[in-house]
């Protein structure tokens, strides 16, 4: 599945893990029918995609959640693909907000974001949300990616 | 538009369709502004795209929506991105699902489900949802595709 | 970043820009952590992407709007992707129509559109939604791009 | 690797019923999705339908969606297809499999497989 020895695919899907911790950071794993092109892209402590050669990529997160209006915050539901590059203040790339639902005990809602973006070498991506307790960990439901133009 | 004889670009983009079939799997059709890049990718039965070379795919759905909370079951609309492979199980790639609006008659949503998996000669992808009455078929609302990577 | 000189890489991602034009067209600006290959594509006018060379592009656009049920008409918020071809009538590529929120003053929202068309030479892109005084311009929320295959 | 014993399989007359059980042993943790096959004489295997372990979301086969349902007892690890409303074309062998976790997208992992259950459907 190469393009030609100097030009390998790189491309990356990985699946939602619930996670105990406090970080507005989701948490990734390769699991499931996960996509791991090979180790030109790779999943840092299950928390942000990781690229070894400059270039564009198009990155894309999905974030399922299950929210109620009255047991959140007045705050929308924020989710933002975030990048980090060597010697570089983080950056938002995208976001997208949903307002909670009305729906009890909670209304589920699906957000998807994706854009064309060139990244450094060593530029790791990864994705925030307001809060990470009402994501949905269900098969197929959350997940992040990208692939190497 | 090859990249090459032995690398032909391949991609689809298809239509949705109205069906009177009780099924939850969409209709598709290859009418309107869709593509059809050459016989390496195939809409089968008008309801999967099935691909004839192995390799990395980005694909994706956008299914729009017109419910209403009271008039629908409780669980939410759910869109499914599915995967049949030869003597595979199927499996559910990526899922997206929001809760039906309070507007009347009906409110109007969107859903994107879109990433990058690894599809094997043969392979079909089709689409879920739990209430095809409930699809809008307007111009350009709800579609189905991918492209190789 | 070339595929070689024949075949160099196209793509482009263009941030949202606020404007008082009471067009329902969006206006988009070179700035943030915007892409522009090379003048294979181009922003015209603050408003269309256009493209040099024939070919099949994956387009997106992602539209974050704040709304309110009382505040709106009736019609849902509507985004549309829409092609201009040279001596081509206007058409629609993609829409996405989410339902107004109850929430107060209003609520968030996330569209995402994406899909793979053939462009010819000097074709443009654009994106029209219902009410652009609803669109929200924070950094990432709202932004527009393609990519050549 | 997982061993996988099928049971439940018989003569049944059309628009009967019957229960398939598959109980699994040995590497249980490893598993992703179980699930069944069914081969007809002179027929390729076929997908009939699936579950996977990490939320129990199921996917069946157009020809048995409404007919049959698969679940599955995490405490005696082991899948079940309830079959009803059967007809002559259900006549098979019926095979379960299971597939290792993390398998991934880029990998056609062998999946395990039990020796299969014979259903007969007739008058």
């Known amino acids: 599945m190469q393009k030609g020895d100097q030009n390998p695919q790189i491309a990356a899907h990985v699946i939602s893990e619930a996670s105990s911790k406090t970080t507005s950071v989701l948490q990734w794993a390769e699991k499931g029918y996960y996509t791991m092109s090979n180790n030109l892209v790779t999943l840092e402590n299950g928390k942000q995609l990781t690229v070894k050669r400059q270039g564009l990529y198009y990155i894309y997160a999905q974030v399922t959640f299950c929210s109620n209006r009255e047991a959140s915050s007045q705050a929308p539901f924020i989710a933002s693909l975030c990048l980090k590059s060597p010697g570089r203040f983080e950056r938002i790339l995208l976001r997208a907000a949903n307002t909670h639902s009305s729906a009890k005990p909670c209304g589920q809602q699906s957000i998807h974001l994706g854009g064309v973006f060139e990244l450094q070498p060593g530029a790791s991506v990864f994705v925030n949300v307001t809060d990470p307790s009402q994501v949905s960990h269900g098969t197929g439901f959350t997940s992040f990616g990208l692939l190497k133009l | 538009m090859q990249k090459g004889d032995q690398n032909p670009q391949i991609a689809a983009h298809v239509i949705s369709e109205a069906s009177s079939k009780t099924t939850s799997v969409l209709q598709w059709a290859e009418k309107g502004y869709y593509t059809m890049s050459n016989n390496l990718v195939t809409l089968e039965n008008g309801k999967q795209l099935t691909v004839k070379r192995q390799g990395l795919y980005y694909i994706y759905a956008q299914v729009t929506f017109c419910s209403n909370r009271e008039a629908s079951s409780q669980a939410p609309f759910i869109a499914s991105l599915c995967l049949k492979s030869p003597g595979r199980f199927e499996r559910i790639l990526l899922r997206a699902a929001n809760t039906h609006s309070s507007a009347k008659p009906c409110g109007q949503q969107s859903i994107h489900l879109g990433g990058v998996f690894e599809l094997q000669p043969g392979a079909s992808v089709f689409v879920n949802v739990t209430d095809p009455s409930q699809v809008s078929h307007g111009t350009g609302f709800t579609s189905f595709g991918l492209l190789k990577l | 970043m070339q595929k070689g000189d024949q075949n160099p890489q196209i793509a482009a991602h263009v941030i949202s820009e606020a404007s008082s034009k009471t067009t329902s067209v969006l206006q988009w600006a070179e700035k943030g952590y915007y892409t522009m290959s090379n003048n294979l594509v181009t922003l015209e006018n603050g408003k269309q992407l256009t493209v040099k060379r024939q070919g099949l592009y994956y387009i997106y656009a992602q539209v974050t709007f704040c709304s309110n049920r009382e505040a709106s008409s009736q019609a849902p918020f509507i985004a549309s992707l829409c092609l201009k071809s040279p001596g081509r009538f206007e058409r629609i590529l993609l829409r996405a129509a989410n339902t107004h929120s109850s929430a107060k003053p209003c609520g968030q929202q996330s569209i995402h559109l994406g899909g793979v068309f053939e462009l010819q030479p000097g074709a443009s892109v654009f994106v029209n939604v219902t009410d652009p005084s609803q669109v929200s311009h924070g950094t990432g929320f709202t932004s527009f791009g393609l990519l050549k295959l | 690797e997982v061993q996988l014993v099928e049971s439940g399989g018989g003569l049944v007359q059309p628009g009967g019923s019957l229960r398939l059980s598959c109980a699994a042993s040995?590497?249980?943790?490893?598993?992703?999705?179980m699930g069944w096959f069914r081969q007809a004489p002179g027929k390729e295997r076929e997908f009939v339908a699936v579950i996977y372990s990490s939320d129990g979301s199921t996917l069946y086969a157009d020809s048995v969606k409404g007919r049959f349902t698969i679940s599955a007892d995490n405490s005696k690890n082991t899948a079940y297809l309830q079959m009803n409303s059967l007809k002559p074309e259900d006549t098979a062998v019926y095979y379960c499999?299971?597939?290792?976790?993390?398998?991934?997208?880029?990998?056609?992992?062998?999946?395990?497989w039990g020796q299969g259950t014979l259903v007969t459907v007739s008058s």
């Open positions: 499999a299971a597939e290792p976790y993390g398998s991934g997208s880029s990998l056609i992992s062998e999946y395990d």
């Open positions: 040995g590497n249980i943790f490893r598993i992703n999705a």
